[in-house]
Amino acid sequence: EDELQVIQPEKSVSVAAGESATLRCAMTSLIPVGPIMWFRGAGAGRELIYNQKEGHFPRVTTVSELTKRNNLDFSISISNITPADAGTYYCVKFRKGSPDDVEFKSGAGTELSVRAKPS
């Protein structure tokens, strides 16, 4: 009951090209310690979309202040959506490790579909 769950509340999200897409994710616990990452796709070929710990992701903003104490909301917004952004996005919790963090639990994924820009 108390073990961390990764909640991605939407199975799918549809956004018009040029708009921003909000992908929601939350954790039910602060434990274990470790960062969260967002990926597009699953398996070995997945693409890193956002890393809470490091990196530069100019199109991605976090919906809430991730440095805020006890924050459990890891939702992101991706700006200027194009058809190339379509796919399934996974919010993944990592457990702090040495030398590398270890994947702990993944959300069930949210499929982003992109509609044509309204004329």
Epitope: E1, D2, Q5, I7, Q8, P9, E10, K11, S12, R24, A26, T28, L72, D73, S75, A108
Partner: antibody, heavy 119, light 107 residues
């Protein structure tokens, strides 16, 4: 066994407000949304709005926008629905229901709170 | 908002009958469709979620089908305890909306 316990029946004057509570026990409050559904005498079910406590966000049916406020207190596992500017047509049974993310079905219901609006 | 139209609004049937209730959405909702049963003076009870998944503890005589805009709830052999009102609910968030209900009465 998950239970939702609602506050008792209310009799209100037109123009006043009512606040109904819904306390969850036996489950993980933050893992679900809470919906509020009302049923006027002899009528069908009407979704008023819902809250995702872990995200701190509420959504409302257009019909009730500006007149209903749904909040949640995670520390007490309690959700609240406040309806203002009451009129006789608001006489109804008000239900809270645990709502599962992704498929948004309501699998656990409170017993209902009868609100009577009468001068 | 997505409108949900249920038909019929009421029906009379006998114990053992096969009963079919339909629900139509005003736009495609994929399989985001749930069904509930409600008896007088009681809270609704979930029967079917995601169009065709049977909720735990619900008898197998209840089944759901459909996708897109057209959905069906079927009771394969009506039992005395099944006389109630049935509601569909679309779950293509948000806002959630219910159908108007179908009252199943004893013939």
């Amino acid at each position: 066994q998950v239970q939702l316990v609602q506050s008792g029946a209310e009799v209100k004057k037109p123009g006043s407000s009512v606040k109904v509570s819904c306390k969850a026990s036996g489950g993980t409050f933050s893992s679900y949304a809470i919906s509020w559904v009302r049923q006027a005498p002899g009528q069908g079910l009407e979704w008023m709005g819902g809250i995702a406590p872990i995200f701190g966000t509420a959504n409302y049916a257009q019909k009730f926008q500006g007149r209903v406020t749904i909040t949640a207190d995670e520390s007490t596992s309690t959700a609240y629905m406040e309806l203002s500017s009451l009129r006789s047509e608001d006489t109804a049974v008000y239900y809270c229901a645990r709502t599962t993310y992704r498929d948004y079905y309501m699998d656990v219901w409170g017993k209902g709170t009868t609100v009577t609006v009468s001068s | 908002d997505i409108q949900m139209t249920q038909s019929p609004s009421s029906l009379s049937a006998s114990v053992g009958d096969r009963v079919t209730i339909t629900c139509r959405a005003s736009q495609s909702i994929s399989s985001y469709l749930n069904w509930y049963q409600q008896k007088p003076g009681k809270a609704p009870k979930l029967l079917i979620y995601a169009a065709s998944s049977l909720q735990s503890g619900v008898p197998s005589r209840f089944s759901g089908s459909g996708s897109g805009t057209d959905f069906t709830l079927t009771i394969s052999s009506l039992q005395p305890e099944d006389f109630a009102t049935y509601y569909c609910q679309q779950a293509y968030p948000y806002p959630l909306t219910f159908g108007g209900g179908t009252k199943v009465e004893i013939k």
